[in-house]
Amino acid sequence: APVSSHCRLDKSNFQQPYITNRTFMLAKEASSADNNTDVRLIGEKLFRGVSMSERCYLMKQVLNFTLEEVLLPQSDRFQPYMQEVVPFLARLSNSLSTCHIEGDDLHIQKNVQKLKDTVKKLGESGEIKAIGELDLLFMSLRNACI
């Protein structure tokens, strides 16, 4: 099985009440604008076939996609939360920059690609949905990486 290295985040990243609250507030505001409740981006399908030791690497991919392809294009919306949450998530992404797995990661890339395709297919409403799931992104990152 692939071995992951440097795929760890310090628990203290998730023990900051202020930024945690802002992240959840941003998610709540965006999810109230999401009218497609049948689709969930961060759920069982995303992690299917991914071992415990690979979960953080997968979440790194999801985090980077969310930052680059979702939050930056929508950066003028959902203020003032967005301007505080984006730098926080960017710091987490930077902390995971050396996280990789040795060996085949094709199964992980396939799962992440399905999430990307879903967001792209839904267009702007897909981006809103992804922002509405930032609470799940935050918690999944925490659970996979600490």
């Epitope: 099985a1 759920g43 992690f47 299917r48 918690m139 659970n143």
Partner: antibody, heavy 116, light 112 residues
Framework: QSVEESGGRLVTPGTPLTLTCTVS????????MIWVRQAPGEGLEWIGI?????STYYASWAKGRFTISRTSTTVDLKITSPTTGDTATYFC?????????????WGPGTLVTVSS | AVVLTQTASPVSAPVGGTVTIKCQAS??????LAWYQQKPGQPPKLLIY???TLASGVPSRFKGSGSGTEFTLTISDLECADAATYYC??????????????FGGGTEVVVK
Amino acid sequence: QSVEESGGRLVTPGTPLTLTCTVSGFSLSSYAMIWVRQAPGEGLEWIGIIDIDGSTYYASWAKGRFTISRTSTTVDLKITSPTTGDTATYFCARDRFVGVDIFDPWGPGTLVTVSS
Amino acid sequence: AVVLTQTASPVSAPVGGTVTIKCQASEDIYTNLAWYQQKPGQPPKLLIYWASTLASGVPSRFKGSGSGTEFTLTISDLECADAATYYCQACVYGNSADSRYTFGGGTEVVVK
């Protein structure tokens, strides 16, 4: 998608016993599996888990007392040296990670009685 | 290891009534909490995860809430079929895997 346990029976203390969990409708290459037990009239107690890559993790109290292994369609739980305190219904369940681990579905359970 | 303390059994209410079951964690578990229903002679059944997300096929009469150390399962419009024992279950990450999954002691619900 279902799981079913088998192999539970009456055994004497110290006699090793292997329970088998057979899965259908999904692949063990996609999901981790857990074992949980429940003594008569008591609550649920996590024993251990076997991951997709075959890695195993046990509750601290269960280390050395149980061994989990698997084939392509079954997951085994070996009780290495049963004592009367191991009398319980043993359940296996699929671990669905959705960002947090959740256990669904569960098998109906298999009863192990340890008595001299 | 985290300890989950549930409302003492039994909790009773009439058909059509409401019951509330509490689950207290000995440390902060964020929203890493699930609820399971178990009827006599049957395996547990997943009801709620992420503290408040309803599992597939579970009626909206079941509602989970809470985060951190205090969690609640509320069952409204009680039916006879809701008579069961309810368990909370926590996932704790970042520590040793030997204490990752913990169950509460269970709370029996009696429907009168």
